[in-house]
């Protein structure tokens, strides 16, 4: 195909791919009609003057995962049709000024995963048609004012995984078309007021894994089109009352892995489109009434691994669309009987790893669609009669690692569990803690005849009548109580893919496979 170099493969579609450690220079001659050229995994260390001179029709050029450390300023001369240029995963420390001169059609420039120490305004001043600029995974310590001033058509800018300690409030001011800005995994400690004011079309802002301690009250006030805001794994200890006030399009907000002690009233809203709110791994101790009441479309609320000891009965007011509520690994001892009454569409609730000693009999009264309830590793000795009766869709109920008191009061629960064993899962079953003579025996098959009679008087209607089998033998303890130790590394809330990918560490928010999707 018009002279394909021996080290390369050339397809009919004018695509050329050159790979292999034996390649130490740009192969020649390259087919004059090549439109796509990939040079991958070679030992090329430098690009000299005009190695692509005879392939002026080239549209896409990928020079990735090589040993490339030096580029001559005229290396890309005569590539006026080039739209996509990737130099990612090389060893570039310096970019020569004028390197991209003449690349008038360039739309995507990928410089990620190199060793770049600085960028200058002159580097990109010729790239007026650039839409995507990837600079993540370099060693950039600061971005000079004017660096992006000529990139007025830019829609995606990735500066993540660098060593940025501060950002000038003027550096993004001309990027009115920017839709995605990623600054994750840097060393930013604060972001000046006005930094994002010019980004009126911004849809995604990734600030996670920095060292941000304080957010300016009006930091996001001009970003009315923002849909995804990632603030997780920073040092944020408080949220200014109005910081999220002007974000009507926001649908995902991650704040996990910060130092939030309280959620100030009205902080979330109005955000009519917010679907997911991630608040795990903070220091929140209580939830007042109406704290989420502006989040009418919220479907996922993750509050696990905080220090919540009190939830006001109206804390979840307004969350009529909520599907997932994670409250596991907190310090809850009591729940008011009204606390979940507004959550008509709730499907999954995780309350494991708390200190709950009892549950109100009507705690799930209005939550008829519940499919999964996690109650393991609490201080429950019994459950109110009929607590699960109306939950026709319940298919997962975890009750193990509680100090069940197997006296005659436990019979209605025992009988209900007997009929609903599949819902308990097979990994670990609830076992008796007291009286001592039945400790460690399965709650489901225990012979309550040998237990101590109860003096407790039930207050609410009983479970549906089910047979009690007094002749069921007492079994020795064959059930090992599973450890409830969880993985404590937080879930990556962000990768460089536009779609967020979730690892399989579902334990962080206590969801099932189906829930985490």
């Amino acid at each position: 195909y018009h002279g394909c170099p021996s080290e390369c493969t050339c397809s009919r579609a004018s695509q050329v791919e050159c790979t292999g450690a034996r390649i130490v220079a740009v192969p020649t001659p390259l087919p004059w009609n090549a439109m796509s050229l990939q040079i991958l995994n070679t030992h090329i260390t430098e690009l000299n003057e005009s190695p692509f001179l005879n392939i002026s029709a080239l549209i896409a050029l990928r020079i990735e995962k090589n040993e490339l450390s030096r580029i001559t300023p005229g290396a890309f001369r005569n590539l006026g049709s080039l739209r996509y240029l990737s130099l990612a995963n090389n060893k570039l420390q310096v970019l020569p000024i004028g390197l991209f001169q003449g690349l008038d059609s360039l739309e995507s420039l990928l410089l990620s995963s190199n060793q770049l120490l600085q960028i200058q305004p002159a580097h990109f001043s010729q790239c007026s048609n650039l839409k995507e600029l990837q600079l993540h995974g370099n060693h950039l310590e600061y971005i000079p004012d004017g660096a992006f001033d000529h990139l007025v058509g830019l829609t995606k800018l990735n500066l993540g995984k660098n060593s940025l300690t501060h950002i000038s409030p003027r550096v993004f001011q001309h990027l009115g078309n920017l839709q995605v800005l990623r600054l994750y995994e840097n060393r930013l400690t604060d972001i000046p007021m006005g930094t994002f004011d010019g980004l009126v079309n911004l849809q995604e802002l990734a600030l996670q894994q920095n060292q941000i301690g304080l957010l300016s009250p009006g930091l996001f006030h001009n970003n009315h089109n923002l849909q995804r805001l990632y603030l997780s794994n920073n040092h944020i200890s408080q949220l200014p009352p109005s910081v999220f006030m002007q974000l009507p399009q926001l649908n995902r907000l991650t704040l996990f892995g910060n130092s939030l002690k309280e959620l100030s009233p009205g902080i979330f809203g109005p955000m009519p489109n917010l679907r997911e709110l991630w608040l795990y791994d903070n220091h929140i101790s209580s939830l007042p009434d109406n704290v989420f009441s502006n989040l009418r479309q919220l479907q996922v609320l993750i509050l696990s691994r905080n220090q919540i000891s009190f939830i006001s009965p109206g804390a979840f007011n307004g969350l009529t669309e909520l599907r997932e509520l994670s409250l596991h690994t907190n310090a809850l001892q009591d729940l008011d009987g009204n606390v979940f009454r507004m959550l008509a569409n709730l499907q999954n609730i995780s309350l494991q790893n708390n200190r709950l000693r009892q549950l109100p009999g009507n705690i799930f009264a209005n939550v008829n669609g519940l499919m999964a309830i996690q109650l393991q590793n609490n201080q429950l000795e019994n459950l109110p009669l009929g607590i699960f009766d109306h939950l026709g869709k319940l298919c997962e109920l975890r009750l193990y690692d509680n100090p069940w008191r197997c006296d005659s009061d436990i019979l209605p629960l025992r009988n209900w569990l007997l009929l609903n064993q599949p819902r308990l899962g097979t990994d670990t079953v609830p076992v008796c803690f007291s009286p001592a003579n039945v400790r460690g025996q399965s709650l489901i098959i225990i012979n309550v005849n040998v237990a101590v009679p109860s003096v407790h008087v039930p207050e609410v209607p009983s479970y549906p009548e089910t047979p009690w089998y007094p002749d069921t033998p007492s079994y020795p303890d064959t059930t090992s109580v599973s450890s409830t130790t969880e993985l404590t590394s937080p879930v990556e809330d962000y990768t460089d893919l536009t779609t967020i990918q979730v690892t399989d560490d579902r334990s962080v928010w206590g969801m099932t496979q189906a829930q985490s999707g």
Epitope: P288, E459, V460
Partner: antibody, heavy 118, light 107 residues
Framework: QVQLQQSGPELVRPGASVKISCKAS????????INWVKQRPGQGLEWIGW????????KYNEKFKGKATLTVDTSSSTTYMQLSSLTSEDSAVYFC???????????WGQGTLVTVSS | DIQMTQSPSSLSASVGDRVTITCKAS??????VAWYQQKPGKAPKLLIY???YRSSGVPSRFSGSGSGTDFTLTISSLQPEDFATYYC?????????FGGGTKVEIK
């Protein structure tokens, strides 16, 4: 319907203690927090604290720590408040209250007048 | 502690008058404010919760508004049975606190 019935008026000496009660009916007593509120004659209202009858857990206004002690008897659906080391400042009407669907006081007892006088 | 400053402390009005009572919180309490009516020798009665929601059985002439730090109780047309003392209360953070009260008297 929810009802909170409080014990009658008390006349007590300075330095003494008094224990007043609040009997709940019309709902499952152990499932909902009970709060106590103080009102001095001709004055405003002060929140003393809450108790969760199902566990006996309490939370107090710092101002009333050491002064008020909240307890519960689930068998009689009754909450108690003991006031100790009484002074004339403790002369007041004390109300027990139950929250509604939020932390507002939807239901009130009729009040118990405590008079501290020698 | 959050201070709830109520004003006026008293007012004189006639039947049919429009009466407005304000309450200012010393810090942001969102919409977590309730209003109560109390008559002599009686327990307070809940009128308004979550700043603007009328409690069941409360006449429509009573309305509440506000959020953050500034709240208002309005009686659109004062009736003879409305002469009483009115209290605001914040329940956003512990300790829960009340305003000093507004006594509505007959002119």
């Amino acid at each position: 319907q929810v009802q909170l019935q409080q014990s009658g008026p008390e006349l007590v000496r300075p330095g003494a203690s008094v224990k007043i009660s609040c009997k709940a009916s019309g709902y499952t007593f152990t499932d909902y927090y009970i709060n106590w509120v103080k009102q001095r004659p001709g004055q405003g209202l002060e929140w003393i604290g809450w108790i969760y009858p199902g566990s006996g857990n309490t939370k107090y206004n710092e101002k009333f720590k050491g002064k008020a002690t909240l307890t519960v008897d689930t068998s009689s659906s009754t909450t108690y408040m003991q006031l100790s080391s009484l002074t004339s400042e403790d002369s007041a009407v004390y109300f027990c209250t139950k929250w509604g669907y939020g932390a507002w006081f939807a239901y009130w007892g009729q009040g118990t007048l405590v008079t501290v006088s020698s | 502690d959050i201070q709830m400053t109520q004003s006026p402390s008293s007012l004189s009005a006639s039947v049919g008058d429009r009466v407005t009572i304000t309450c200012k919180a010393s810090q942001n309490v969102g919409i977590n404010v309730a209003w109560y009516q109390q008559k002599p020798g009686k327990a307070p009665k809940l009128l308004i919760y979550s700043a603007s929601y009328r409690s069941s059985g409360v006449p429509s002439r009573f309305s509440g508004s506000g959020s953050g730090t500034d709240f208002t109780l309005t009686i659109s047309s004062l009736q003879p049975e409305d002469f009483a003392t009115y209290y605001c209360q914040q329940y956003n953070s512990f300790p829960y606190t009340f305003g000093g009260g507004t006594k509505v008297e007959i002119k």
